[in-house]
Amino acid sequence: IYGGQKAKPGDFPWQVLILGGTTAAGALLYDNWVLTAAHAVYEQKHDASALDIRMGTLKRLSPHYTQAWSEAVFIHEGYTHDAGFDNDIALIKLNNKVVINSNITPICLPRKEAESFMRTDDIGTASGWGLTQRGFLARNLMYVDIPIVDHQKCTAAYEKPPYPRGSVTANMLCAGLESGGKDSCRGDSGGALVFLDSETERWFVGGIVSWGSMNCGEAGQYGVYTKVINYIPWIENIISDFGGGGSGGGGSAKFVAAWTLKAAAHHHHHH
Amino acid sequence: MASMTGWKIHYTSTAHACPYPMAPPNGHVSPVQAKYILKDSFSIFCETGYELLQGHLPLKSFTAVCQKDGSWDRPMPACSIVDCGPPDDLPSGRVEYITGPGVTTYKAVIQYSCEETFYTMKVNDGKYVCEADGFWTSSKGEKSLPVCEPVCGLSARTTGGR
């Protein structure tokens, strides 16, 4: 996180640390699912059990955390690795339910009305243990408040080289300051960009840290996030088809609107 | 001169009547007859909220047949009050006995609730009654447990710490 500050206990109780290859993040859904970026869990997809999933901690290196393990990984079928970041979304099913408390709480999925809290200039919050402006992974969970950027403005920012035309799709949203300095970065990948629903007083996930400019926090460039509201049917289908309850049991996965990968991941951390 | 026609013997037989079936408490015998002889049968029906049991084992129906030796082919069952048994534990929740401590028999009421703050009840209001079929049943007719679903989106940033 560039230009951020240290999170305090209970600020981001949905924050999940994903280790396996390198560092990435995710957000807890319900009590046995993790929402993350497809690119963050793609390369080690042939061994789900290799994913080391930690939650309930602020400190990246702390021995005090709640351990969770993956039962299955579901990568969106529209995601093509190393060919842009469209459909950069994945779900991890945990093999057991986690106990919810003030330090471990799921994030809400956006309601239909959520777009009214995600208009241009509305503030979202990104959090993670990724690179800071000092050039190192953060030891303490960091967060930054950043405004949503007009979609056309973001598309234009990424139409000049070295970015290929069409990098920013309708399945993405952008956030950051035109002047730069506040952004998510490598190692934050898969984490949630959250917004406050002022009607329910609950936080929901609007974006997933996906990609951005080569230099995090660069002026005139923005962090790009998977637009979660476009994937609500996909998320709900997988969760209903593959069961809310973590059984610890496994069983052969079936193919629903996703590649079903009993998989763990190597993380690119383009962000 | 008398004609020789031989002996005539007339046989009559009376079937052994079986003992009169006394209905178990909270049950009744059908059909009611003055007596029950060979191949006659009776069934036992229990009042609502009571079930046929042979010892610990449940029966859906009971019919006994009178045998030629004057005994019934099956012993009389009992009509025992339906017992739904201890309710299942609710993950991330608890159960309270409303009717009385540990009361799990017909028409007993229990109330499920979820752990405060972090879980909320889905499916129904958590009130279950022991019905005549032996299942704990919600007011909506569900026999499955309610669900304690985690409350999402809570943060110390909005609640000022919890």
């Epitope: - | 010892g55 084992l57 449940p58 859906k60």
Partner: antibody, heavy 114, light 107 residues
Framework: QVQLQESGPGLVKPSQTLSLTCTVS?????????WNWIRQPPGKGLEWIGY???????SYNPSLKSRVTISRDTSKNQFSLKLSSVTAADTAVYYC???????WGQGTLVTVSS | DIQMTQSPSSLSASVGDRVTITCKAS??????VAWFQQKPGKAPKPLIY???YRYSGVPSRFSGSGSGTDFTLTISSLQPEDFATYFC?????????FGGGTKVEIK
Amino acid sequence: QVQLQESGPGLVKPSQTLSLTCTVSGYSITSDYAWNWIRQPPGKGLEWIGYISYSGRTSYNPSLKSRVTISRDTSKNQFSLKLSSVTAADTAVYYCARYWGDYWGQGTLVTVSS
Amino acid sequence: DIQMTQSPSSLSASVGDRVTITCKASQNVGSNVAWFQQKPGKAPKPLIYSASYRYSGVPSRFSGSGSGTDFTLTISSLQPEDFATYFCHQYNTYPLTFGGGTKVEIK
């Protein structure tokens, strides 16, 4: 003629779940009675595991209750046993039986071993 | 749990002998007791239910009696095919329990 037939793996690894199915022919399991699982360790006596009744209610031996699930598939006229976290002490011949034992399956030996 | 104590645990007898096996329940079980015969490698075969009711097809030499806590299985004239192990079973009270068995061997 009422017949019961047990089926399932004969070898289960320790800590895993033992799963057996009893297929009933000649009588519907929803018509009446309790449908039991009973086991017999080699050279030992009989132990009642539990039953599922005609209505779908279950009753389990308290010594095994935390590990046992008995369920049924009425469309196939089958009832099943699942016993979790098995150890060598769960090695036995497993029988399914109707009511108080008027009809029995032939039994299936399940060995718990790594 | 109700203990069903069978005695003797084994006995030797000759063809034609009258054999009596007893089963004592640790609590009153009414007449809800069954008796089974089991041969090596085979499933138990039902003989008696409700303490004294013989299953159809079971020879009349087998009879059962008793109620409450004391139960008896009698074989009036032992036949060669009767050499086996016999179990009593109470189904009156949860959990259902079995006796330890009586092995009837050839003298």
